[in-house]
Amino acid sequence: QPDAINAPVTCCYNFTNRKISVQRLASYRRITSSKCPKEAVIFKTIVAKEICADPKQKWVQDSMDHLDKQIQTPKP
């Protein structure tokens, strides 16, 4: 789970060890702050949970790409 120590900086200290289906993902944001111990991606899921993930993992990169394409494709 993401953890905000001194708002507004949110950091991730652990990454999920389970792949999340893109069908369960709503959005994401990157964590690149130098105040955080590691770079991370925080996925917001369709059930409103936020999950920390490792941006080096392929499934994380693929999921971000998928979400980016969803944003770029206008809904009919």
Epitope: K19, I20, Q23, V47, A48, K49
Partner: antibody
């Protein structure tokens, strides 16, 4: 340790309704969903529906749509399943089970509630 | 709805033998969001395997799951007396989260 404790056995008349409760302890209730699954005597498992309190989502199997209502009371960490217009074929053991809304496998189950529909 | 078909309906084996149970989906279960449960008479089901191949907490190593897409398998490498039960697969990629009809593993 997560525990789901269900209400006791019920005997109901055809056409009436039954409301089964499922009280959760040992976990963060609102962070998880509750599914309801039933099992008729000698038969397999049948998924009825689910509720995810955090997201406010409720899902029902088409077979039960309009007859089943699943609710949750976060203040008491209790989920409810109400089935109306009961018929003899609804005689079954009804289980509640916890799932993580991001995934969906049912990792903790209640002990089951036997509902008998008989005139 | 995704329909899951389990085979065989009944498997008659002796303790120590290997059990192979199959679960076939009517359409692809993406990201292998498939679970296996064990149920003994008079008891609630118990989660054995999730995400097709991950063992749930406390499940012995003799239970393993495999597969992707539409074909999934639960293997019990060497049957113990307590393993004789009914096994169900379930997909949870989409609602309704359907179950297979079950495979009964009985003592030969």
């Amino acid at each position: 340790q997560v525990e789901l404790v269900q209400s006791g056995a019920e005997v109901k008349k055809p056409g009436s309704s039954v409301k089964v409760s499922c009280k959760a302890s040992g976990g963060t209730f609102s962070s998880y969903g509750i599914s309801w699954v039933r099992q008729a005597p000698g038969q397999g498992l049948e998924w009825m529906g689910a509720i995810n309190p955090l997201a406010g989502h409720t899902h029902y199997a088409q077979k039960f749509q309009g007859r089943v209502t699943i609710t949750a009371d976060e203040s008491t960490s209790t989920a409810y399943m109400e089935l109306s217009s009961l018929r003899s074929e609804d005689t079954a053991v009804y289980y509640c089970a916890r799932y993580d809304g991001i995934y969906g496998e049912l990792d903790f189950w209640g002990q089951g509630t036997l509902v008998t529909v008989s005139s | 709805d995704i329909v899951l078909t389990q085979s065989p309906a009944t498997l008659s084996l002796s303790p120590g033998e290997r059990a192979t149970l199959s679960c076939r989906a009517s359409q692809s279960v993406s990201d292998a969001y498939l679970a296996w449960y064990q149920q003994k008479p008079g008891q609630a089901p118990r989660l054995l395997i999730y995400d097709a191949s991950s063992r749930a907490t406390g499940v012995p190593a003799r239970f393993s799951g495999s597969g992707s897409g539409t074909d999934f398998t639960l293997t019990i490498s060497s049957l113990e007396p307590e393993d004789f039960a009914v096994y169900y697969c379930q997909q949870y990629i989409s609602f309704p989260a359907t179950f297979g009809q079950g495979t009964k593993v009985e003592i030969k």
